[in-house]
């Protein structure tokens, strides 16, 4: 297994991967295979109402330099905690002996996995774009039970969500073949997105590729500067009972996902008021409704908050609320 994989993101579209060769390889290492796949954001992030008091915004940081497999907890943790940094204690003689035993066991176990669990892959002509080969098949563990599949229908809405679920690992994962080096720059990635990277050492190219068990590392690309900005107009509709429906478009490709919007509005001469619009509420109203507004001139600004932080405030939108007598409304409460 390749040792100590380290993943670093140096831009919003790249991850640098470095590793060390296996300590005790089976024969000569001819090349390495690196696969990567986009990770879905935790489903909880889509469900929670981050406007509720006491609910901290989730913290997601991109992968800083020298992040190893053992230090992945940083960008996988749900909420950020600032713990003091520690350094490891010197190893005892018994620990060193234990590690040597583990190294020997790992080599024996890898041989076992090669021969018993995995069927070797056929030769590939990898281009780096996608994996045209069949994935390494596990030996059959029995048939899967019957699955009822409903008849597909034409969906009414175009599938344009920026937060769609990434494709399954079996659907042509991108990969790169690395020869004569222990590093790779993975490019063309989505901004502020978590990736699971799989690294294998191979000791034969043809006729059958023989590769090690994978080492895994996770990394997140850096945020894109303006990705969380609301583009397009903030529109408004004034209903008869001084209800103003503000509407805006979700940023097309946000950093991770938008968890809430801040609405800042004020009547001319009054102090600014703030309103938090959760993802859930925005999904229902495509904006928010301001109710019980006193007559006068108003300005409103909106900004989105994503997993990476705040976007920019929109340019102010202005509207005028007339002096409206309390007529029963035909709009829901």
């Amino acid at each position: 297994v390749p040792l100590d994989p380290i993943s670093v993101s140096n831009s919003s579209s790249q991850i640098i991967l470095k590793w060390k060769p296996p300590s005790d390889p089976n024969g000569n290492i001819t090349h390495y295979l690196v696969f990567w796949e986009r990770q879905a954001e935790d489903s909880e992030l889509f469900e929670l109402d981050y406007c509720l008091k006491g609910l901290k915004l989730p913290s997601r940081t991109w992968s800083p330099p020298f992040e190893s497999e053992d230090s992945q907890k940083h960008n996988q943790s749900e909420y950020e905690d600032s713990a003091g940094e520690c350094c490891s204690c010197p190893k005892t003689d018994s620990q060193i002996l234990k590690e040597l035993e583990e190294s020997s066991f790992r080599k024996t176990f890898e041989d076992y996995l090669h021969n018993v669990v995995f069927v070797p892959r056929k030769t590939s002509s990898g281009t780096g774009a996608e994996d045209p080969r069949p994935s390494r098949k596990r030996r059959s563990l029995g048939d899967v039970g019957n699955v009822t599949v409903a008849v597909p229908t034409v969906a009414a809405f175009p599938n344009t969500s920026s937060t769609s679920v990434p494709t399954s690992p079996e659907e042509h994962r991108p990969f790169e073949k690395v020869v004569n080096k222990e590093s790779l720059v993975i490019s063309g990635l989505r901004h502020f997105t978590g990736y699971r990277i799989e690294l294998q050492a191979c000791n034969q190219d043809t006729p059958e590729e023989r590769c090690s068990v994978a080492a895994y590392v996770s990394a997140r690309t850096m945020p894109e500067a303006k990705a969380d900005d609301i583009v397009g107009p903030v529109t408004h509709e004034i209903f008869e009972n001084n209800v103003v429906h503000l509407m805006w478009q979700e940023p097309k490709e946000p950093n991770g996902l938008i968890v809430l919007y801040e609405v800042s509005y004020r009547r001319y001469g009054d102090e600014e008021l703030h309103l938090c619009v959760s993802r859930k509420h925005f999904a229902l109203e495509r904006g928010c409704r301001l109710r019980g507004l006193s007559p006068g001139n108003y300005s409103v600004r909106i900004r989105a908050t994503s997993l990476a932080g705040n976007g920019s405030w929109t340019e102010p939108t202005y509207f005028y609320v007339t002096d409206y007598l309390d007529v029963p409304s035909n709009i829901a409460k």
Epitope: F46, S161, E237, A283
Partner: antibody
Framework: QMQLVQSGAEVKKTGESLKISCQGY????????IGWVRQMPGRGLEWMGI????????RYSPSFQGQVTISADKSISTAYLEWSSLKASDTAMYYC???????????????WGQGTLVTVSS | QTVVTQEPSFSVSPGGTVTLTCGLS?????????PGWYQQTPGQAPRTLVY???TRSSGVPDRFSGSILGNKAALTITGAQADDESDYYC??????????FGGGTKLTVL
């Protein structure tokens, strides 16, 4: 492919309880509001209420508040419509429908289940 | 109680044009109500034709178009075909997760 699949037809007696279901496929179920619509025999469509499966927040039409319970189990991407004591007047076709997803401008009911026919006899 | 009004029935000749409307018992319909139009043939689930006033759903022919005409929402069908014979419902979004449907229009293609 996005779709909503509803449970099969039900024949019940007055006073009995019933829970019908609507399962979502092909999209992020927890992130989309799901509504329920009633259609009595030979009549038009009536809005009943809506649920956000992510945290089960519900909003009911005043006509149906207290008459039915809307719930969801996000772990199996399923929304439910429930009666504790059926009446003959509950005989109808019930549809679930997905409220427009976030990427769509405006509010609308977009994708519909095939409907569940509930027949209540006395 | 808000009432959404539609013509109970309408006839159109094949190839002709028909405009169905959707109004409010009090006040006027605007884009803020996000008017939607739904087609239902007997024994079938409703199908979304138009949403957000004038956006056609995926797979809906461009013979169907939505708009605001005066103080009402409107669905116009140009070049009517025999299989357009259906019930058509409009729905207005009233806020806070509430929709109100119109009573429906039965369209006959003669």
């Amino acid at each position: 492919q996005m779709q909503l699949v509803q449970s099969g037809a039900e024949v019940k007696k007055t006073g009995e309880s019933l829970k019908i279901s609507c399962q979502g496929y092909g999209y992020r179920f927890t992130d989309n509001w799901i509504g329920w619509v009633r259609q009595m025999p030979g009549r038009g469509l009536e809005w009943m209420g809506i649920i956000y499966p992510g945290d089960s927040e519900t909003r009911y039409s005043p006509s149906f508040q207290g008459q039915v319970t809307i719930s969801a189990d996000k772990s199996i991407s399923t929304a439910y419509l429930e009666w504790s004591s059926l009446k003959a007047s509950d005989t109808a076709m019930y549809y679930c429908a997905r409220h427009a997803p976030l990427a769509v401008a405006g509010m609308a009911l977009g994708d519909w289940g095939q409907g569940t026919l509930v027949t209540v006899s006395s | 109680q808000t009432v959404v009004t539609q013509e109970p029935s309408f006839s159109v000749s094949p190839g002709g044009t028909v405009t169905l409307t959707c109004g409010l018992s009090s006040g006027s319909v605007s884009t803020g109500y996000s008017p939607g139009w739904y087609q239902q043939t007997p024994g079938q689930a409703p199908r979304t034709l138009v949403y957000n006033t004038n956006t056609r759903s995926s797979g809906v022919p461009d013979r169907f178009s939505g708009s605001i005409l005066g103080n009402k929402a409107a669905l116009t069908i140009t070049g009517a075909q025999a299989d357009d014979e259906s019930d058509y419902y409009c729905a207005l979004y009233m806020g806070s997760g509430t929709y109100v449907f119109g009573g429906g229009t039965k369209l006959t293609v003669l």
